[in-house]
Every structure is written in structure tokens, then in C-alpha cells.
């Protein structure tokens, strides 16, 4: 009974619910993540426990500092929900649920080029497709390492397309594309495709 009274005596502003967060919210399978459980009251000795559904994953004590739980997301069911419990001697509170979004990384995209050659111009169509990776995928096209398109979002497994017209160039142009989904800091590039300079029959991608 005393413990219950003691807990009731701790006003909500003195011992509110803890906060559970992670710097990484979108992850791929096999990724190591850190989860932070923190509390507004910095002068209490707090025991933090982390749960995934009803499974207890670990316990840490601290005062003034968040508890840091390091874990690896290897299976789909490990996406969550996670919950953190903050406990003082006679009182405990739970955080809101936290879940990760598991995303499959994009594989290196394939760049295809189609060219219609006129006397003065080249009409170039670039196609880029990554056959694996969670949708949506953002594609960006590059010419000589400079982005020439905005990010093109594809919500289906269809190639992104970008058209450009160029005066018949005197120099080689190198094209490549980038595929990126919601995984932060994880982008892949196609192999570069070199478009030869004009002169003779040097247009292997041209439609005759």
C-alpha cells in the first residue's frame, strides 16, 4: 500500500513517462541500431528496461543520462513495437511504442540508353531500373558526374525515364544513374555508359 501511495505522490510532472527513440528509424535486416530511453527528471536514479512486445531485452540504470540499448535487427518481427520502462524504487512508467521500418536496400541499377540522331541533335532517352529494393525508389540521372535530372520517384518496378536533347557533341559524355530508397546513406549507382563523340558511325545506341 505504501508503495502505491508513494507512486501516487510522485506528480506526473516529477515522474512522467520516458521517451524511447532511435537516430535510425529506417533500417535494413542485419543492421545494428541504438535505442535511447530517456527521462525528463535528471536527478532521479532510474532503472530503464527495454521490451519488444513482451520480451525483456535488457535493463540499465542511470541518473541524468539516457539508457542506450544496442541491438541488431535481423528478422522482420524485430521491427517492433519496442517499449521502454522507467522505474524508480516504487513507481514505473512506460514509453510510447516505437517501431522500425525495415527496408530492403536497392541493388545496383541498370542504365539503358536510347538515342535518336538527327543531323544537328541527339535525342537521348535514359532508362534506369533497380530490380531489387523496397519501393518507392528515387532515381537520379548524371552526366559526367553532374546531376541532370531531379529525383524521379517510382512506386512500381518500372524504369525511371529521362529525356534530353543535345547538340551533336564533340566530346564523349558519360552517363550513370543513382537509385536510392528510404534507407539513409545507402545509394547505389549504375555502371557508367559512355556516349562517344560524333563522327562517322560512332553512335552505338542510335536508332537508325
Amino acid at each position: 500500500r505504501k508503495a502505491v501511495l508513494d507512486c501516487e505522490a510522485m506528480k506526473t510532472n516529477e515522474f512522467p513517462s520516458p521517451c524511447l527513440d532511435s537516430k535510425t528509424k529506417v533500417v535494413m535486416k542485419g543492421q545494428n541500431v541504438s535505442m535511447f530511453c530517456s527521462h525528463k527528471n535528471k536527478s532521479l536514479q532510474i532503472t530503464y528496461s527495454l521490451f519488444r512486445r513482451k520480451t525483456h531485452l535488457g535493463t540499465q540504470d542511470g541518473k541524468g543520462e539516457p539508457a542506450i540499448f544496442n541491438l541488431s535487427i535481423t528478422e522482420a518481427h524485430e521491427s517492433g513495437p519496442y517499449k521502454c520502462k522507467a522505474q524508480v524504487t516504487s513507481c514505473s512508467k512506460y514509453s510510447r511504442d516505437f517501431s522500425f521500418t525495415i527496408v530492403d536496400p536497392v541493388t545496383s541499377p541498370v542504365l539503358n540508353i536510347m538515342v535518336i540522331q538527327t543531323e544537328t541533335d541527339r535525342h537521348i532517352t535514359l532508362h534506369c531500373l533497380s530490380v531489387n529494393g523496397s519501393l518507392p525508389i528515387n532515381y537520379t540521372f548524371f552526366e559526367n558526374h553532374v546531376a541532370i535530372s531531379p529525383a524521379i520517384s517510382k512506386y512500381d518496378r518500372e524504369p525511371a525515364e529521362f529525356n534530353l536533347t543535345k547538340k551533336n557533341p564533340g566530346e564523349e559524355e558519360e552517363y550513370r544513374c543513382e537509385a536510392k530508397n528510404r534507407l539513409p546513406n545507402y545509394a547505389t549507382y549504375s555502371h557508367p555508359v559512355t556516349m562517344p563523340s560524333t563522327g562517322g558511325d560512332s553512335c552505338p545506341f542510335c536508332l537508325k
Epitope: S43, L44, Q60, D61, K63, G64, T89
Partner: antibody, heavy 119, light 110 residues
Framework: ESQLVESGGGLVQPGGSLRLSCAVS????????VGWVRQAPGKGLEWIGI???????YYASWAKGRFTISKDNSKNTVYLQMNSLRAEDTAVYYC?????????????WGQGTLVTVSS | DVQMTQSPSSLSASVGDRVTITCQAS??????LDWYQQKPGKAPKLLIY???KLASGVPSRFSGSGSGTDFTLTISSLQPEDFATYYC????????????FGQGTKVEIK
Amino acid sequence: ESQLVESGGGLVQPGGSLRLSCAVSGIDLSSYAVGWVRQAPGKGLEWIGIIGRSGSIYYASWAKGRFTISKDNSKNTVYLQMNSLRAEDTAVYYCARDVDSRPPTGSLWGQGTLVTVSS
Amino acid sequence: DVQMTQSPSSLSASVGDRVTITCQASQNTYSNLDWYQQKPGKAPKLLIYQASKLASGVPSRFSGSGSGTDFTLTISSLQPEDFATYYCQSTSWGSSYVGGFGQGTKVEIK
């Protein structure tokens, strides 16, 4: 009356080991964190580490590896295991209950136990 | 580890003087800061805990203030028994942070 009493100090040869005990009375070890602090002769206070209520342990970076803190709640005792001792580990070793804010309680220290590392 | 920088490292003062000792933490330690008084051959004695709370039995001439990284211990009117060494201690601790002591301030008779 709450009390902490250290024991286990004494003379030890360089490279040797020693286990210090901190017997706690009037305090429930499952309700408070207890830390270890040392003071070399003529020097300042040096924080070694702390063991929390649930048993998580944190060390000063210099103490990791050679020093190990543990506790036995049933005996209401906290331990400091010290390995590979060196002359510079000669000091008075104190255990102390950590400050908490509910109920508002200041820290409480033992009287200290002297460890001398010498051949 | 948190670094606690105490200043001055020593000071000379007379009975009745107002004495101020400062302590700066290298990281935010909130209000988790204690002040201790130590006399030769004795265990440290707690004066102030949680930055500003007076420990039991400590005279009211001792006071503490500050939060975050900057803290102050003030003795409003120095008494003969106050000549000693004073230490600050960060008492925050956890996964990413461990406490520590300042190097001490020796208060001597002028």
C-alpha cells in the same frame, strides 16, 4: 542509522590482486546505487565506478579492465576487485551511496580502507 | 568521462571573508553536482548535493548554485573550522557518461 563500512585493504605486491568489500547497513542495495572512489596520498579524489540498483556498472575510462565492481544484494555488500595492481594504485578506497532525489538524500560515505601496493 | 574544472586551485582568506569556488563540467550534468569538504586524514564530508541542497547538519553559511555546466560554492562568512580542501563532483552517470571530481580547492588562512 545508515552506514557503509569498507574492508579488505592492506599491503599487496605489484602485479597482485585484492578484493575490497563495502558492507551496507540501513540501506536497501536494490534501491540505491553505490560507487567507489579513491584518494592517493596527498592527491585529490578519483572516481572509479558505480553499480546501479539493477546491477548495471559504469567505470571511469582509466579503471576499465583492471577494476571490477559487483554486489550481492542478499549480503547487502558491494565489492571492488582490483587486478594487476601497481604502485600508483596505493590509495584510500571509499565506497559511497549515490545521491538520489526521491526521497531527497545526499551521498553517504564509508570511512575508507587503505591499499598499499609495494614490494 | 566528464572533466570537472575547479577554480581556484587554492586561495588564502581571513575569518569572516566571503569565499566563492567555481566548478565547470565538460558536459551537461544538469543539477547533479555535489560539493565536499575534506580535512587531512578524514573522509570527505558532504556539504551540498544536487547543486543547491544543503546536506543535513551543514551550517547555512554554505550555499551552492548553478546547473548544466557551471556551478558555484559560496561560504558567506568564513569560520576557523572551514579551512580545508573543497571538491566538486558530477553525479550524473549512465551509458554515455560517467561522473568525476574537480581537482580540489585548498582554502588556507591568510
